[in-house]
């Protein structure tokens, strides 16, 4: 028969024949032959391979270096890498989480739209009309201006995106 030019899923073409890939958690020792199956070997302690593969070596689990602000979020297995995350107040700089940076603070005039996590930074938004933020914070949302009317007071100084309104007593005309 004609040698194959393509193979099924979870197979690969080698020496004019289709061989089975090694399952996750195992590495390739030798290709299949006309008479033998693909030979695979389990990954060692602290090693992994996460896909059907023909890798000749397993990869070491990632080290979550505390000197870089990293800690283990999920311990690796023979089929998964260790997942790192960042210490409180910090977040990863990439999906692979190789290093951490301090959460961004939202400047006065901006409030926190979404609080940062171990893998995403703070998302800030400008305070809309009727709201303000007078601090630089990684947690504070924009606050609504004080309602002078509900306190039976009047606005003496208008609010901005960075300052609250200033309320004062109403001028009462004597009869």
């Amino acid at each position: 028969p004609e040698p194959p030019t393509a193979c099924r899923e979870k197979q690969y073409l080698i020496n004019s024949q289709c061989c089975s890939l090694c399952q996750p958690g195992q590495k390739l020792v030798s290709d299949c032959t006309e008479f033998t199956e693909t030979e695979c070997l389990p990954c060692g302690e602290s090693e992994f391979l996460d896909t059907w593969n023909r890798e000749t070596h397993c990869h070491q689990h990632k080290y979550c270096d505390p000197n870089l602000g990293l800690r283990v979020q999920q311990k690796g297995t023979s089929e998964t890498d260790t997942i790192c995350t960042c210490e409180e107040g910090w977040h990863c700089t990439s999906e692979a989480c190789e290093s951490c940076v301090l959460h961004r603070s939202c400047s006065p005039g901006f409030g926190v739209k979404q609080i940062a996590t171990g893998v995403s930074d703070t998302i800030c938004e400008p305070c809309p009309v009727g709201f303000f933020s007078n601090v630089s914070s990684a947690f504070e949302k924009c606050h609504p201006w004080t309602s002078c009317e509900t306190k039976d007071l009047v606005v003496q100084q208008a609010g901005t995106n960075k300052t609250d309104v200033v309320c004062g007593p109403q001028d009462r005309l004597r009869a």
Epitope: Y12, N15, D31, D50, N53, R54, E55, H59
Partner: antibody, heavy 120, light 107 residues
Framework: QVQLVQSGGGLVQPGGSLRLSCAAS????????MSWVRQAPGKGLEWVST????????YYTDSVKGRFTTSRDNPKNTLFLQMSSLRAEDTAVYYC?????????????WGQGTLVTVSS | EIVLTQSPATLSLSPGERATLSCRAS??????LAWYQQKPGQAPRLLIY???NRATGIPARFSGSGSGTDFTLTISSLEPEDFAVYYC?????????FGQGTKVEIK
């Protein structure tokens, strides 16, 4: 057909940063291990970095560890190399390369290459 | 890491001649060796993988052999487009490494 189209090279001062991109098409990007290989002017090929299909696991040659970051955007079929604290010895043509089915190497498809020159 | 040493550094031959390029590994790479061709101003191109398997679209005049530490790329009859630099690369151990290259030039 498989294509890897690179962008983002150029001249940068020592200590500077640069981001290279590699747009992939013609194959299921997330199923393949991707790598960066560089070639200094008049020199041979040197493996720089590898990222597994998930994007969670990355590997680097010792000389770029802590300075280069490889990432991928699987929905957009794009590979990235963020280079910082660049040195004169990082001057090279950088290639993105795709691993064969089930393996990191050999590299069966390569980008066209992009020149990074680190000089003051 | 595994060091690959290619010889000769330069091979001067005429079209139609047979080219024999050598790649020696500092330790066994079993059969996990590949060969690439690179022309000036171009990206490398995979020729041979796992010692002797031709990549898609590679002509039959290119063949690979060897095992363990000693490998050979043979071009049975050189065509004008074959004059280029050739690199070997191993994947037996991490990290992947390349030889320094052999330049095949026109005599």
């Amino acid at each position: 057909q498989v294509q890897l189209v690179q962008s983002g090279g150029g001249l940068v001062q020592p200590g500077g940063s640069l981001r290279l991109s590699c747009a992939a098409s013609g194959f299921t990007f997330s199923n393949y291990v991707m790598s960066w290989v560089r070639q200094a002017p008049g020199k041979g090929l040197e493996w720089v970095s590898t990222i597994r299909g998930s994007g969670i696991s990355t590997y680097y040659t010792d000389s770029v560890k802590g300075r280069f970051t490889t990432s991928r955007d699987n929905p957009k079929n794009t590979l990235f190399l963020q280079m910082s604290s660049l040195r004169a010895e990082d001057t090279a043509v950088y290639y993105c390369a795709k691993g064969i089915v089930g393996a990191t190497t050999p590299f069966d498809y390569w980008g066209q290459g992009t020149l990074v020159t680190v000089s003051s | 890491e595994i060091v690959l040493t290619q010889s000769p550094a330069t091979l001067s031959l005429s079209p139609g001649e047979r080219a024999t390029l050598s790649c020696r590994a500092s330790q066994s790479v079993r059969s996990f060796l590949a060969w690439y061709q690179q022309k000036p101003g171009q990206a490398p191109r995979l020729l041979i993988y796992e010692t002797s398997n031709r990549a898609t679209g590679i002509p039959a005049r290119f063949s690979g052999s060897g095992s363990g530490t000693d490998f050979t790329l043979t071009i049975s009859s050189l065509e004008p487009e074959d004059f280029a630099v050739y690199y070997c690369q191993q994947r037996s151990d991490w990290p992947p490494t390349f030889g320094q290259g052999t330049k095949v030039e026109i005599k």
